[in-house]
């Protein structure tokens, strides 16, 4: 069956060094346990996280995300997942694309991460 993929409409904000969560879901909601689910970064499609055949595929990850990501799957039975990125870096800022693939049918949603410096301040004039 066909579905749409839905992610945040507005940029998600995170501080350098913190963790951030990027939610994504399919509509209408349905069990996505047997689907391939992942995040990549355009424009070069670097794999941030990949879930396939019921498990996380760590070997496919881009090196800069290895050991820093976790797919929260508690609600995957309803078609809802969240990518957690730990130890956020300035280089994480920008676009991310979440996708769900069911056999040959794939849909995706783009989202944006804004990364801010927790120690930034403006000196008094």
């Amino acid at each position: 069956g066909q579905f749409r993929v839905i992610g945040p409409r507005h940029p998600i904000r995170a501080l350098v060094g913190d963790e951030v969560e990027l939610p994504c879901r399919i509509s209408p909601g349905k069990n996505a346990t047997g689907m391939e689910v992942g995040w990549y970064r355009p424009p070069f499609s670097r794999v941030v996280h990949l879930y396939r055949n019921g498990k996380d595929q760590d070997g496919d990850q881009a090196p800069e995300y290895r050991g820093r990501t976790e797919l929260l799957k508690d609600a995957i039975g309803e078609g809802k997942v969240t990518l957690r990125i730990r130890n956020v870096r300035f280089s994480d800022e920008g676009g991310f694309t979440c996708f769900f693939r069911d056999h040959s049918y794939q849909e995706e949603a783009a989202m944006e991460l804004k990364v801010e410096d927790p120690f930034y301040w403006v000196s008094p004039g």
């Epitope: 945040p8 409409r9 913190d18 879901r25 509509s27 508690d74 609600a75 809802k80 969240t82």
Partner: antibody, heavy 119, light 107 residues
Framework: QVQLVESGGGLVQPGGSLRLSCAAS????????MNWVRQAPGKGLEWVSA????????YYADSVKGRFTISRDNSKNTLYLQVNSLRAEDTAVYYC????????????WGQGTLVTVSS | EIVMTQSPATLSLSPGERATLSCRAS??????LAWYQQKPGQAPRLLIY???NRATGIPARFSGSGSGTDFTLTISRLEPEDFAVYYC?????????FGQGTRLEIK
């Protein structure tokens, strides 16, 4: 099955404070964002506040900003709303409701707890 | 803040008739729109999400349509238990906002 049970409402004088609680069960609490929505007697629904699943991000309606504080204890599966500097116009039934990551509607609601602000 | 406007405020119909409720957003909410039903003394219940999908356990007589700024909830054949207040809500932008409600009453 999913259950949300609010408590902590009551009669309070203007300027007073209360702490509302929402006990959650039947789902992985930390995976869901949580919201408070209120309804004044005979009126419509007004979103009040939201908090992310981890508790790291909070959001407020302008009408309560600086007076209300939302928080959660994921180890106790409980959502809170600290309400301070209460005004007569805060009189309402306060509902907790869950959503997924701020990208979903409110699919489950509690039964509500009544807050009455009157001298 | 996105303002949601529902019409009509009150709709008087008889069981078996078709009900059409409207909701308009002050700016595009894409398909991030839900419809809720509320009966006296009860919490709201989710009926429709993402503008057109029925929530779990909702009868097929309820349907939603629209995208962008204009949305419709249709109840194809009213049952006695359908008489209640209906709210639309956008959840695409914080603050999440509700319409003022449409009261569906028995004629």
């Amino acid at each position: 099955q999913v259950q949300l049970v609010e408590s902590g409402g009551g009669l309070v004088q203007p300027g007073g404070s209360l702490r509302l609680s929402c006990a959650a069960s039947g789902f992985t609490f930390s995976s869901y964002a949580m919201n408070w929505v209120r309804q004044a007697p005979g009126k419509g629904l007004e979103w009040v506040s939201a908090i992310s699943g981890s508790g790291g991000s909070t959001y407020y309606a302008d009408s309560v900003k600086g007076r209300f504080t939302i928080s959660r204890d994921n180890s106790k599966n409980t959502l809170y709303l600290q309400v301070n500097s209460l005004r007569a116009e805060d009189t309402a039934v306060y509902y907790c409701a869950r959503d997924y990551g701020g990208i979903s509607p409110f699919d489950y609601w509690g039964q509500g707890t009544l807050v009455t602000v009157s001298s | 803040e996105i303002v949601m406007t529902q019409s009509p405020a009150t709709l008087s119909l008889s069981p078996g008739e078709r009900a059409t409720l409207s909701c308009r957003a002050s700016q595009s909410v894409s398909s991030y729109l839900a419809w809720y039903q509320q009966k006296p003394g009860q919490a709201p219940r989710l009926l429709i999400y993402d503008a057109s999908n029925r929530a779990t356990g909702i009868p097929a007589r309820f349907s939603g349509s629209g995208s962008g700024t204009d949305f419709t909830l249709t109840i194809s054949r009213l049952e006695p238990e359908d008489f209640a207040v209906y709210y639309c809500q956008q959840y695409g932008s914080s603050p999440y906002t509700f319409g003022q409600g449409t009261r569906l009453e028995i004629k």
